[in-house]
Structures are given as C-alpha cells and as structure tokens.
Amino acid sequence: LPAQVAFTPYAPEPGSTCRLREYYDQTAQMCCSKCSPGQHAKVFCTKTSDTVCDSCEDSTYTQLWNWVPECLSCGSRCSSDQVETQACTREQNRICTCRPGWYCALSKQEGCRLCAPLRKCRPGFGVARPGTETSDVVCKPCAPGTFSNTTSSTDICRPHQICNVVAIPGNASMDAVCTSTSPTRSMAPGAVHLPQPVSTRSQHTQPTPEPSTAPSTSFLLPMGPSPPAEGSTGD
C-alpha cells in the first residue's frame, strides 16, 4: 500500500524534512504550509490548525513562497532620472532603471539605486568605450587625421575628409575644409563604413593636438563630485 499522504500540519518523521512549499514551525514543532507569492502569514500554524494566509496590501509584495507576518514594502517611486521597468504588484517589487543617456553608478539587488548622466566627450574628443547600463562613457582625444566637433556621449572620432585642395586643414575638433566643390572622399556621419584613421593619417599635416586641446591626465578621471573631467562635459 502507498504511504498515506500527510496533510499539514503534521509532525515530520525523525531526521526528515518538510516537503516543498512547507516550513517547519519551531513553536508548533510541525510541518506547516507556506503562503504563496502575493500573500503573507496572517495566523501561524499550531499543532491542530494550518497557516492562515492573506493577500498583501497595496504597495507591498512577497515574491517567494513564505511565512512572513507582513509583506515587504515596495521601493519608493522612481526618480526623474529613472524609468519604472517593473511595476509594484503583490508579487514583485518595483524596479527602477536609468533612463537613456544615464548609467547606473550605484546598483542594488534589482534595478538601480543611483543613476548618473553619461559623460559627454567634448569637441576634440571621441568615445573610446560606449556607456553601458552600469558603466560610464570613456573619452579619448581624437588622433591625428580624425576629429569630433560634437559634445556627445556616442560620437566617435571620425576621419577628416580628403580634399583635392585643402582650404583649412582639419584638427582634432574640426573637419578639413576643401576649396574644390567636392572632396575626393567625404566622411559624412551617415557613411556606413568609415575607413580606418590610420589609412588617412599620412595624408594630413595635422600634428598632435594643439596645446589648447591636448588633454591633461585629468580627462581620464571619472566624473563625480569633482568638476567635469577634461575631454568631457557634465551637460
């Protein structure tokens, strides 16, 4: 004959554990039912009666099978630099993530505690590493033969256009200006494949960035309470 199924509450056999979705109540010394996600234990079990569960109230939740006396409070509303990617329900906490153009500077178990704006590389500097959900943009100075004329958290250094006749040589923050009606090769931002900067470097007279744009090592420091780093802007 199959073993008789025990209904909660029941005393476990010596050395055995309670079944899935049950817990051992130390006071009653019985295996008792857990409450399902979205509920909490309103009345704990006794030797003769099982756990009494009740639904979580508004703005509270339980995500797991549990026997907690009170549901957990949902986190506070998302701040203005965040978006709510998961709403507060009886079964899950609110999750706030950083809105586009921001990254998570201080994460928590789920979502983000503190968002910070992505660093923007100023003209003469391009993005060396794009920002991610959890890391800031890294800027680098534009190498000879390349330029960036924008203040942007996404723009890379682009090669100067090649001119038949150069009116104004390009520098780190400005494209070359051609005298002829059209350049030999235009490096429009919309071009699908940009040639390697190295392939154009020997064709440009521009030396290393002028002293006014050459970075100090401070451009490498992450932005924080200190002033914006050289090569980046907090705007």
Epitope: A128, T132, E133, T154, H193, R201, T208, P209, L220
Partner: antibody, heavy 118, light 107 residues
Framework: EVQLVESGGGLVKPGGSLRLSCAAS????????MGWVRQAPEKGLEWVGQ??????????YYAESVKGRFTISRDDSKNTLYLQMNSLKTEDTAVYYC?????????WGQGTLVTVSS | DIQMTQSPSSLSASVGDRVTITCRAS??????LAWYQQKPGKVPKLLLY???SLHTGVPSRFSGSGSGTDYTLTISSLQPEDFATYFC?????????FGQGTKLEIK
C-alpha cells in the same frame, strides 16, 4: 552575466575561407562595440578588427595584416558577431577571441582555434 | 602605426615583492592605455584602462601611472595568483596595438 561564445574554427588549407561566429548574451549587444583579437600559438595578442554600434553607423576597422581579406559584420537581431576570413595564410593560424566593450576589452570569449595548414 | 614596447620581456620575482612593468609608445598616446593579465591557457583579463583606472573587481595592489609615451604597471605586493603574462595596449589610434608581453615568473 556577460557571455561570448565563439564557433566556426578549424583546419583550413592556405587560400581557403572560414567564417567565425560569436554568440553574445548578458548585455545589450546592439549598443556594444565588438571586435576580434587573435593570439598565435605561444605568441602575443594581435588586434584583428572591430565594428562599432548602430549609433555610429556600424563603422568597421581592420589591422593592416587582414585588410581586404577579412570582413567583420554583426546581426543585432541575433546578438551575433561574425568574422569572414578569406585568402587565409599560414600566419593567420591563431586562437581568435571575440571581445567587447570598446577600444579596449572588458570581456573576452574563450576563443576558437583556426589552423591554416596544407 | 603606433608601436608598443614592453620591458622587461620576462621577470622573476617572489611573493610580497613590488614589481613594475613598463610600456613605451612610439608616440604620445594621451593615457589611452590598457593593461591585461593572461594566465597560461586562459583568456586575457582587463586590469586597468585610461592608464590608471582600475577595472571593476581588480585588486587595489595593481596600479598604473604614466603619461605621454611612457607608462608603468605596478603590483605593490605580489600574490601567488599574480604570476602571469601582462600586456599593454594603446587605444589612442587605429590600428589598436599591443605590447609584446611581459612574463612574470616565480623566483
């Protein structure tokens, strides 16, 4: 957790072709810059090339040693990076690593071995 | 192309030692330098970027310094797990280039 898994390596004769794939997960692939770095047996690291993201119009860059023979592409809908290698030479023999996140590399795949030999 | 030259090519040291590895670029790379550690049969691991920024999860005994063309990686007190090969890499300009590597061995 960021994961990069390369596949497609193997033995190929000089002049032959091979296509490597890199399946990415654990991060927003479409925003990431992806690249390939190789390492010949018992040698140092050599950058092969990279492809940047859509916001930069997917520019590609290559090492001089592979330019014209290798092509990097990506399929953001499949979270996959590709390296098409044509006109292979014996000196292309190496472990090829898929990398991310920029002009320096936070994450690396385990690598796939490409052997070019007659 | 920007050439990266590392020295020494190999180095013997003991646990607890302070070790310095240098990397010289053929032209100014404006601190656009990364350092990697690679153990035999393993994948390279990023240690530092921007010459002196410690990557997430890297122990503070690793530090970087330098500017212009000359850069150093310092390990303040060698641990057994630090014996490996170290590479520098410039990302100022394409093509991105690596140093030839420095093998750090147990004395």
């Amino acid at each position: 957790e960021v994961q990069l898994v390369e596949s497609g390596g193997g033995l190929v004769k000089p002049g032959g072709s091979l296509r490597l794939s890199c399946a990415a997960s654990g991060f927003t692939f479409s925003n990431a810059w992806m690249g390939w770095v190789r390492q010949a047996p018992e040698k140092g690291l050599e950058w092969v090339g990279q492809i940047k993201d859509k916001s930069n119009n997917y520019p590609t860059y290559y090492a001089e040693s592979v330019k014209g023979r290798f092509t990097i592409s990506r399929d953001d809908s499949k979270n996959t990076l590709y390296l098409q290698m044509n006109s292979l030479k014996t000196e292309d023999t190496a472990v090829y690593y898929c990398t991310t996140y920029g002009d320096f590399f936070d994450y690396w795949g385990q690598g796939t071995l490409v052997t070019v030999s007659s | 192309d920007i050439q990266m030259t590392q020295s020494p090519s190999s180095l013997s040291a003991s646990v607890g030692d302070r070790v310095t590895i240098t990397c010289r670029a053929s032209e100014d790379i404006y601190n656009a330098l990364a350092w990697y550690q690679q153990k035999p049969g393993k994948v390279p691991k990023l240690l530092l970027y921007n010459a002196n920024s410690l990557h997430t999860g890297v122990p503070s005994r690793f530090s970087g310094s330098g500017s212009g063309t000359d850069y150093t990686l310092t390990i303040s007190s060698l641990q057994p797990e630090d014996f490996a090969t170290y590479f520098c890499q410039q990302y100022y300009d394409h093509p991105l280039t690596f140093g030839q590597g420095t093998k750090l061995e147990i004395k």
